[in-house]
Every structure is written in structure tokens, then in C-alpha cells.
Interface confidence: low
């Protein structure tokens, strides 16, 4: 019986040990599991954070790429505008210089004319006066008629002269004013992005007009909204006007006036004085006169360019400018020597 | 003895079971461990990949930001260059225009001089001839009255002539200069950012006009949606120069530039003089004059402010240009009225 009890105690102990080992193993498994779960949570969290950061960075990158693309477009447009501006200014300047030459030539011609007419008048007076004197001295017995005969030429001479001068006078302004009108007339009509209602009128850019003549309201963009549309560029009447250049040589070198781009915006909208229209302008997309541009913010930027290739060569523009300026300077110098 | 053997067998079994359980648990632990290690490796790998990607993106972002900054500088430089270019051109042009005026004036003076000399020559000849005749006739005992009758026309001639010349002279330049001024008046109308009600100040830049001639109402914004830019737009002396604008109102420059807002797109939308439409312009996308930008809104209006970190708004570079030109136009107008 003792032995039996001893053995049973032994078995009992072993069973307890088994239970202990079992629960210890279970605990161990649970602990390992917990440990791994915690570790995994940290790793997964890191991954999530990383992914979020990646998304943020990608968004920022996209945004920046879009902005960059837009900026590149801006730079390109700037170059384009600048080139056009230079071309336009050069053109205006050359027009001015040419007009100056014309004015000088006209002046010389007028002076020549006035001098010639003056000489002729003097000569003809000498002639008629010689004749008159001769007659007077010869026929003293008929005073009256002679006096009249003597008087007539006198009055006629000045008149004749007056006419000459008068012509001179009336002719002078004509070319001058015509020049300007013509020049304005030349300014090509720009078309805005929008549907233009008015001014397909030829006289659009008229300058001084005869009394009573209505002036046409201009519908032309002052220059193509730069960035915008390519073709939308106009002349800046500002200078164009200032030039009062006789555009009778429409073949004018260089850029067609169509391409004389002027700063972006500038669309003009003129109205005849008499009308009280509340013409208002809203900046419209096309208002931009830009090629493909919308500066409507990140928003509409569609340029998502990935590259950072600043292929725009911003600085060539400088060279271009320089060339143009040299050209102008030369013209100016020539002009100054005139 | 049997019982003992039985108990011992039982104990043996339990020990074996314990060993089995132990090894089973060890195996289980190893398996779990292996499983977790594999999973962890995947997660860590993901993290590493993500970190690498983050670094790549950050590098790309930094590079792009640098390039973007550089490009912004380019744009600013462009604005500056353009402003300077416009200023220079404007100056050149104003020089040319002023010179043209001078040439015209000199021409008129020379013509006047030549005419005067001619008149004087004729007058002095008339005088001496009158004297001669008087003497001759007196010698022949001819009556005095008749001589006077004959003399009158002589004296009148020069006067008449003088008048004619006078007219010739004073009228000649008028149209001529008016032409230019007028032409400037034509300078296209710029839109302000805001809805412009046409002809706010109808007489504003008016020059004298022939009776009855309608004036084009100009509704131009004082400044043009410049790039807003930096301060570069403020005034473009260029025109200012061209205008020979009396800047005795310095207050015009500077501060007001804040208000020189110009719409962003400035589309022009002109209407035939007769229409009374309340057409307004909104800054629209194309208003941007930029390739990827939309200036279609108040927003996109750029005030030609000097400061205002708006110089960053690359999208509005065009605006700046516009501002400048508007500014110029206005100055020009002011100058005309002076």
C-alpha cells in the first residue's frame, strides 16, 4: 500500500508538471504572439506613415510639376512676348524714323517750293513792273487806265503768291495727318478670343476725323494677351499712334503686324464717347490671349511635367533683346544725326 | 510487484508524454517564430522600399523646388528685362517723336523765314520801286494821287501774303501735331480688373478736336494687370519718357500703382459705337496670356504693385506687362492733355 501511494504521488506530480509545462508553453506562445503583434503594429504603422508621406510627397511633386510646367509656359510666353514686343517696338521706331525722313524731305520740298515760288513771283513782278513803268512813262497823257493797269499786276501777284502759299499750307498737313491715319488704319485688327461683334470695321483705328464723323469703337486686343493666344496679338496703338507713321508701306518689313504681340492683356475696348454703355470686362479665360494658358491657379494647371528640364532657355531672350536694342540704338543714332 | 510495475509503466508513459509535449511546444514556438520572422521581413522590406522611395521623392522635390525657384527668378528677370526694354524703347520712341516734332517746328520756322525773307525782298523792292516811280513821275510833272492809287496794292500785297503765310504756318503743324496726339489718344483701352464702366471720365484725356468729332471714350485701367510684379512695373518711364509727361504730379507714380490693377485677361470686347450693351469682362482663363494659366478672375487681376510678393505669381507675369503698358498709355494720355 505504501508503494502504491508513493507511485500515485509520483504520477500526480508528473501530471501537475505536465499542466505547468502546458500552461507555460501556452503563455510563451501568447507572449511571443503579443510581442510579434506589437512589433508588427509598429512596422505596419511605419509603412502606413511612409505611404502617407509618399502620397504627400507625390502630391507635392505633382503640384510642383504642374506649377513648374506652367512656369515654363510662362517663360516661353515671356520669350515670345518679348520677341514680339521688340519686333513691334523696332517696327514702330523704324516707322518713326522713316516718317522723320519723310517729314524732312517734305520740309525740304516745301522750302524749295516756297523759295522757287517766291523767286518766280519776284521775277514776274520785275517783268510786269518793267512793262508798267515803260507804259507809264510812255503814255502820261492817259493816267487813269495806266494806273489801273499798274495796279492790277500788283494785286494779282500777291494773290498768285497767296495761292501758292495757300497750297503749300493746305498740303502740308495733309500728308502729315494722313500719315497718322493711315498708320492707324494699318494696325491690324486683332481678334480676341471671344467672338467679336464689332469692328470688323475697316476704319477702326481712325485718328482725327472730319467733324461729325463717328469714330468706330475698337474691338481689338491690345496685344494679344500675351500669354495667350498665339495669334492674338495686336499693336499697341499707344506707340502706333505715337508714331503717326505713314503706313503707306504696308509691306513693312518684319513681323506682320499681326504678330506684334503686346503684353498680355491689354485688350482694348473703346467706345464712342456718346454712348454711356457700362462696358465692363471680366477676365475671361480666353481673355488671356495666351496659347495654352490658364493661370488659374494650381487648379487649372495641367502641365504636370515631371521633368525639371528648364528647356526654356530663358536667357536667350536676353540676347534677342540685346540684338533688338542694338538695332534700335543704331536707328536712333542715325535718327539723331538726321 | 505487479502493481509496482504497473505504476512504473504509467510513470514512464507520462514522462514520454512530457517529452512529446515539450518538443511539440518547442516546434510550435519555432514555427510561430519563423512565421513572424518571415512576416516581419516582408514588413521591414516594405518599410525600406518606402523609405527609399521617400528619399527619391524628397530629392526630386528638392531638385524641382530648386529649379522652380530658379525659374521664378528667370521670370522675375524677364519682367525686369521687359520693363527695362519697354522703358528703353519708349524712351527711344519718345526721342524720335520729339525729334520729329522738332524737325516739324524747325521746318515751319524755316519756311516762315524763307517766306518772310521773300516778302521782305518783295516789300523792299516795292518800296524802292515806288520811290523810283514817284521820282520818275514827279520829274514828268505827273499828279500825286495817281501814284498813290498805284502804290496801294503794293503795300497790300505783302500783308496779304503775310496773312496767307501766317495761316499756312499755324495751320500746318496743328493737324500734324494733333495727329500724333490724337493718335495717341487712340491708344487702346485697357481694362481694369474691375468692371469698368466705360467713360468714367469722358473728357479725361481729351485733346481739342474738330467740332463735331466724336471722341472715343477710353476706359483704361490705370495699370495693367501686371505681373503684379514685384515692383518692376510701376511706371514705365519708357512711355513716360515718350510722353514727355509732365511728372509734376509725382503722386501719380508710386502709390497709385497699387491701384493700377488690370484685369487679368483683359479681353477686349469692343462694340460698335452705336450699341449700348452693358458688356462686361471677366477675367477668364485665357485671360491669362499665359500658357497654362487662367486669369479669369478678380484674382487674376494684377495690380501693378511694387511690393507685394505677388512677384511670385508667375502666372501673372503677363499681367504685369499689361500693367506697364497701361501705365504707359495713361501717362501718355496725361502727357497729351498737358
Amino acid at each position: 500500500e505504501l508503494k502504491k501511494n508513493e507511485f500515485q504521488g509520483e504520477l500526480e506530480k508528473q501530471r501537475e508538471q505536465l499542466d505547468k509545462i502546458q500552461s507555460s508553453h501556452n503563455f510563451q506562445l501568447e507572449s511571443v504572439n503579443k510581442l510579434y503583434q506589437d512589433e508588427k503594429a509598429v512596422l505596419v504603422n511605419n509603412i502606413t506613415t511612409g505611404e502617407r508621406l509618399i502620397r504627400v510627397l507625390q502630391d507635392q511633386l505633382k503640384t510642383l510639376q504642374r506649377n513648374y510646367g506652367r512656369l515654363q509656359q510662362d517663360v516661353l510666353q515671356f520669350q515670345k512676348n518679348q520677341t514680339n514686343l521688340e519686333r513691334k517696338f523696332s517696327y514702330d521706331l523704324s516707322q518713326c524714323i522713316n516718317q522723320m525722313k519723310e517729314v524732312k524731305e517734305q520740309c525740304e520740298e516745301r522750302i524749295e517750293e516756297v523759295t522757287k515760288k517766291g523767286n518766280e513771283a519776284v521775277a514776274s513782278r520785275d517783268l510786269s513792273e518793267n512793262n508798267d513803268q515803260r507804259q507809264q512813262l510812255q503814255a502820261l497823257s492817259e493816267p487813269q487806265p495806266r494806273l489801273q493797269a499798274a495796279g492790277l499786276p500788283h494785286t494779282e501777284v500777291p494773290q498768285g503768291k497767296g495761292n501758292v502759299l495757300g497750297n503749300s499750307k493746305s498740303q502740308t498737313p495733309a500728308p502729315s495727318s494722313e500719315v497718322v491715319l493711315d498708320s492707324k488704319r494699318q494696325v491690324e485688327k486683332e481678334e480676341t478670343n471671344e467672338i467679336q461683334v464689332v469692328n470688323e470695321e475697316p476704319q477702326r483705328d481712325r485718328l482725327p476725323q472730319e467733324p461729325g464723323r463717328e469714330q468706330v469703337v475698337e474691338d481689338r486686343p491690345v496685344g494679344g494677351r500675351g500669354f495667350g493666344g498665339a495669334g492674338e496679338l495686336g499693336q499697341t496703338p499707344q506707340v502706333q499712334a505715337a508714331l503717326s507713321v505713314s503706313q503707306e508701306n504696308p509691306e513693312m518689313e518684319g513681323p506682320e503686324r499681326d504678330q506684334l504681340v503686346i503684353p498680355d492683356g491689354q485688350e482694348e475696348e473703346q467706345e464712342a464717347a456718346g454712348e454711356g454703355r457700362n462696358q465692363q470686362k471680366l477676365r475671361g479665360e480666353d481673355d488671356y490671349n495666351m496659347d495654352e494658358n490658364e493661370a488659374e491657379s494650381e487648379t487649372d494647371k495641367q502641365a504636370a511635367l515631371a521633368g525639371n528640364d528648364r528647356n526654356i532657355d530663358v536667357f536667350n531672350v536676353e540676347d534677342q533683346k540685346r540684338d533688338t536694342i542694338n538695332l534700335l540704338d543704331q536707328r536712333e543714332k542715325r535718327n539723331h544725326t538726321l | 510487484e505487479l502493481k509496482k510495475n504497473e505504476f512504473q509503466g504509467e510513470l514512464e508513459k507520462q514522462r514520454e508524454q512530457l517529452d512529446k509535449i515539450q518538443s511539440s511546444h518547442n516546434f510550435q514556438l519555432e514555427s510561430v517564430n519563423k512565421l513572424y520572422q518571415d512576416e516581419k521581413a516582408v514588413l521591414v522590406n516594405n518599410i525600406t522600399t518606402g523609405e527609399r522611395l521617400i528619399r527619391v521623392l524628397q530629392d526630386q522635390l528638392k531638385t524641382l523646388q530648386r529649379n522652380y525657384g530658379r525659374l521664378q527668378q528667370d521670370v522675375l528677370q524677364f519682367q525686369k528685362n521687359q520693363t527695362n526694354l519697354e522703358r528703353k524703347f519708349s524712351y527711344d520712341l519718345s526721342q524720335c517723336i520729339n525729334q520729329m516734332k522738332e524737325v516739324k517746328e524747325q521746318c515751319e520756322e524755316r519756311i516762315e523765314e524763307v517766306t518772310k525773307k521773300g516778302n521782305e525782298a518783295v516789300a523792299s523792292r516795292d518800296l524802292s520801286e515806288n520811290n523810283d516811280q514817284r521820282q520818275q513821275l514827279q520829274a514828268l510833272s505827273e499828279p500825286q494821287p495817281r501814284l498813290q492809287a498805284a502804290g496801294l496794292p503794293h503795300t497790300e500785297v505783302p500783308q496779304g501774303k503775310g496773312n496767307v503765310l501766317g495761316n499756312s504756318k499755324s495751320q500746318t503743324p496743328a493737324p500734324s501735331s494733333e495727329v500724333v496726339l490724337d493718335s495717341k489718344r487712340q491708344v487702346e483701352k485697357e481694362e481694369t480688373n474691375e468692371i469698368q464702366v466705360v467713360n468714367e471720365e469722358p473728357q479725361r484725356d481729351r485733346l481739342p478736336q474738330e467740332p463735331g468729332r466724336e471722341q472715343v471714350v477710353e476706359d483704361r485701367p490705370v495699370g495693367g494687370r501686371g505681373f503684379g510684379g514685384a515692383g518692376e512695373l510701376g511706371q514705365t518711364p519708357q512711355v513716360q519718357a515718350a510722353l514727355s509727361v509732365s511728372q509734376e504730379n509725382p503722386e501719380m507714380e508710386g502709390p497709385e500703382r497699387d491701384q493700377l490693377v488690370i484685369p487679368d485677361g483683359q479681353e477686349e470686347e469692343q462694340e460698335a459705337a452705336g450699341e449700348g450693351r452693358n458688356q462686361q469682362k471677366l477675367r477668364g482663363e485665357d485671360d491669362y496670356n499665359m500658357d497654362e494659366n487662367e486669369a479669369e478672375s478678380e484674382t487674376d487681376k494684377q495690380a501693378a504693385l511694387a511690393g507685394n510678393d505677388r512677384n511670385i505669381d508667375v502666372f501673372n507675369v503677363e499681367d504685369q506687362k499689361r500693367d506697364t503698358i497701361n501705365l504707359l498709355d495713361q501717362r501718355e494720355k496725361r502727357n497729351h492733355t498737358l
Epitope: 480666353d286 481673355d287 491657379s297 | 452693358n278 479669369e296
Partner: antibody, heavy 119, light 108 residues
């Protein structure tokens, strides 16, 4: 004068559809980007959608909350802007404004039209 | 999405006072893309200031704006009774275009 007149609002049941219209005048419609902005009762302003001009192929943009449910469109010949709203939710209840705008701004606003989504 | 936080939510003020509203962006934006609107009860919103500091047409000079990066402000130099309204800031830098929750200006 710039005028934007919205019409088409009303009471709709959830999951229903409705089309808002906006008649524009006083400016050159075809050159302006257009937007819809809404304001829910007691809440702030929320941009809904934007459509650019023909020059930009009528590109559209939407707020996440309406993406795939709302469609913005325009008819330049009639100077009209539209917002087709499908699968409406109660949270779409708001005053809807037709707005002109450019670089992310909203320049001119219509008087608004009310949409109520309720069962 | 760029979140704009306006403070305070409500601002009581008396006519003649100087009032300043602030608008904070969750990430930096160019000042060219921050705009302010005024919404009076019963009216449509109205553009007040665009590009941080430019007054829209018809807006009285007592309004002014400033700021850069993530911090912007709208100031009414001398408040008038007619200025009672809710003022919203808005960013146009990225889609979605977002508004702040608004600051209600009330009479004290």
C-alpha cells in the same frame, strides 16, 4: 452689368437627380471659366465644380464630395452653365451659386438657387 | 487638400474700431492664391480682396489684406455698421479650391 441667374433648384429625394442651370449675360461667357459653389444651411462656402473654356477643351474639376455624381457643362452659344446632379444625398442640400472666376478666385456670383434633398 | 483655418469664429466689434481676421493655411501657398469674400445675410458672396492684398472693384479702402506663406489676415481699418457680415478666406492654389469656415463680424 454682369448677371448670373441660377434656376432648377427644388426638393428632391435622396438618390434622385436634378439639373441646375445658370444664364449668364453682361460679359463674354465663352472666354470665362465657370464654377458652381454651394453653401449648406448654417455652414460655410464649398466649391463644387469648375469648367474651363473651349480653348482648354472644356476641362472640368470637381470637389471630392461630388466626384462621380455631379457633372458640370456649358453651352457657349446660349451663355449657359449647367450642373447635372445624380445620386443626390441629404448633405447636398444647399444654396448653389453660379460663379465666374479665374485663378482660383470667384469674381461674380449669381443670386443662387436652393436644392433640398430630403425624403 | 489645403485646409484654411479662420479665427476667431465670431468677432464682436463696434463701429469705428479696427478689426482683424486671420486665416491660416495647412500648407504654404503663394500669396497670389489667397482671397477674401464677404457674405452678408440675404446676399450672395462678394469678392472683397484678391491675391492677398488687392481690393476688388467697389470695395472701400478701409479694407486691406496681407500675409504670406501660411498666415494671412484681413483688416477693416475703421469698422462701419454695414460691414457686419461673415468673412471667408479662400485658396486657389490647388484643387479642391477651399474656403475657411468664416469669421462672423457682429456689432457689439
Amino acid at each position: 452689368e454682369v448677371q448670373l441667374v441660377e434656376t432648377g433648384g427644388g426638393l428632391v429625394q435622396p438618390k434622385g437627380s436634378l439639373k441646375l442651370s445658370c444664364a449668364a449675360s453682361g460679359f463674354t461667357f465663352n472666354t470665362n471659366a465657370m464654377n458652381w459653389v454651394r453653401q449648406a444651411p448654417g455652414k460655410g462656402l464649398e466649391w463644387v465644380a469648375r469648367i474651363r473654356t473651349k480653348r482648354y477643351n472644356y476641362t472640368t474639376f470637381y470637389a471630392d464630395s461630388v466626384k462621380d455624381r455631379f457633372t458640370i457643362s456649358r453651352d457657349d452659344s446660349q451663355s449657359m452653365l449647367f450642373l447635372q446632379m445624380n445620386n443626390l444625398k441629404t448633405e447636398d442640400t444647399a444654396m448653389y451659386y453660379c460663379v465666374t472666376g479665374g485663378t482660383g478666385t470667384f469674381d461674380y456670383w449669381g443670386q443662387g438657387t436652393t436644392l433640398t434633398v430630403s425624403s | 487638400e489645403i485646409v484654411l483655418t479662420q479665427s476667431p469664429t465670431t468677432m464682436p466689434a463696434s463701429p469705428g474700431e479696427k478689426v482683424t481676421f486671420t486665416c491660416s493655411a495647412s500648407s504654404g501657398i503663394s500669396s497670389n492664391y489667397l482671397h477674401w469674400y464677404q457674405l452678408k445675410p440675404g446676399f450672395s458672396p462678394k469678392l472683397l480682396i484678391y491675391r492677398t492684398s488687392n481690393l476688388a472693384s467697389g470695395v472701400p479702402a478701409r479694407f486691406s489684406g496681407g500675409g504670406s506663406g501660411t498666415s494671412y489676415s484681413l483688416t477693416i481699418g475703421t469698422m462701419e455698421a454695414e460691414d457686419v457680415a461673415t468673412y471667408y478666406c479662400q485658396q486657389g492654389f490647388s484643387i479642391p479650391l477651399t474656403f475657411g469656415a468664416g469669421t462672423k463680424l457682429e456689432l457689439k
